[in-house]
Interface confidence: low
């Protein structure tokens, strides 16, 4: 069983909000990790979207629109990526990753968990 699990595909209508889920295996505690989200469009490498540890400890990638936001459900051991006002260019692969929370937050190298699995979020014209 992989350390991280994401559903293989999701779809939603343009203009709506979609929430992608990243579930951490039960022998790990999401409460001690930052959740990182990446977007990968066809022909491009993955790009950093955001990091979420808590409401008071999070960071957005430069120029990443606020339509992209992170959250966590510690009880369910899950991280979430919400994308509001879905646009055609949001059709992409989305990757989550867990990183050890560091005291210097974004300034320090991250330690990656073993595995990252993709979620494909596909927008469709209603």
């Amino acid at each position: 069983q992989p350390v991280l699990h994401q559903p293989p595909a999701m779809s939603s209508a343009l203009g709506t909000t979609i929430r992608l889920t990243c579930t951490l295996r039960n022998d790990h505690d999401i409460g001690v990790y930052s959740v990182y989200w990446y977007q990968q469009r066809p022909g491009h490498p993955p790009r950093f979207l955001l990091r979420y540890f808590s409401q008071s400890d999070k960071s957005q990638g430069p120029q990443v629109p606020p339509r992209f936001s992170g959250s966590k459900d510690v009880a369910r051991n899950r991280g979430y990526l919400s994308i509001s006002e879905l646009q055609p260019e949001d059709e992409a692969m989305y990757y989550c990753a867990m990183g050890a929370r560091s005291s210097e937050k974004e300034e320090r190298e991250r330690e990656w968990e073993e595995e990252m699995e993709p979620t494909a979020a596909r927008t469709r014209v209603p």
């Epitope: 990182y36 990446y38 977007q39 066809p42 022909g43 491009h44 490498p45 993955p46 790009r47 950093f48 979207l49 990638g61 430069p62 120029q63 990443v64 055609p88 260019e89 990753a97 974004e106 300034e107 320090r108 190298e109 991250r110 990656w112």
Partner: antibody, heavy 117, light 107 residues
Framework: QVQLVQSGAEVKKPGSSVKVSCKAS????????INWVRQAPGQGLEWMGG????????NYAQKFQGRVTITADKSTSTAYMELSSLRSEDTAVYYC??????????WGQGTLVTVSS | DIQMTQSPSSLSASVGDRVTITCRAS??????LAWFQQKPGKAPKSLIY???SLQSGVPSRFSGSGSGTDFTLTISSLQPEDFATYYC?????????FGGGTKVEIK
């Protein structure tokens, strides 16, 4: 404050190789891609390739495929571009640039590579 | 590869002039277009991303527009520090490609 500092100018013989470094500071190195762009004297900008540091995958322009290797050392937050089988047409300023989700915002100062016999 | 064609290749203008530079892609690139400014001996500087979004710290006299294949960079009132070469770049797909550049010179 994000900074990309490149290695110094190089003079190389035709047929040899050059390795240019690009040290990043002020940000999470593994969160971004590093692109390499070159500019021959009096010419425009030409993308050579890039590497996504966190994921390790590199992508190269067809023109340079087999001659260029882009790598990154996470422990020193440094990216490298090695170009082999140098010829006179490779004389150019080589830039590294950080890909910030949309496009390259932060650029190194440039490294002049001169290929001459 | 996607070809990016910029026009004009050079232009002469005076301080205060409105300047327009166009960039055409050989195929549709949505809004995945950036504009850069480069001065002699310096690295390029990002002005516009996503075709029309102004980079942080860039004066509002710079604006971008367009989608698909046709794009425009406009300088509403040319300032002395704006004399430089401007490049468009598509990042819709690899390989990333630049336009040939437009040199803005003093008339």
């Amino acid at each position: 404050q994000v900074q990309l500092v490149q290695s110094g100018a190089e003079v190389k013989k035709p047929g040899s190789s050059v390795k240019v470094s690009c040290k990043a500071s002020g940000g999470t190195f593994t969160a971004y891609a590093i692109n390499w762009v070159r500019q021959a004297p009096g010419q425009g900008l030409e993308w050579m390739g890039g590497i996504n540091v966190g994921f390790g995958g590199a992508n190269y322009a067809q023109k340079f495929q087999g001659r260029v290797t882009i790598t990154a050392d996470k422990s020193t937050s440094t990216a490298y571009m090695e170009l082999s089988s140098l010829r006179s047409e490779d004389t150019a300023v080589y830039y590294c640039a950080r890909d910030d989700y949309w496009t390259s915002v932060y650029w190194g100062q440039g490294t002049l590579v001169t290929v001459s016999s | 590869d996607i070809q990016m064609t910029q026009s004009p290749s050079s232009l002469s203008a005076s301080v205060g002039d409105r300047v327009t530079i166009t960039c055409r892609a050989s195929q549709g690139i949505s809004n995945y277009l950036a504009w850069f400014q480069q001065k002699p001996g310096k690295a390029p500087k990002s002005l516009i991303y996503a075709a029309s979004s102004l980079q942080s710290g860039v004066p509002s006299r710079f604006s971008g527009s367009g989608s698909g294949t046709d794009f425009t960079l406009t300088i509403s009132s040319l300032q002395p520090e704006d004399f430089a070469t401007y490049y468009c770049q598509q990042y819709n797909s690899y390989p990333l490609t630049f336009g040939g550049g437009t040199k803005v010179e003093i008339k």
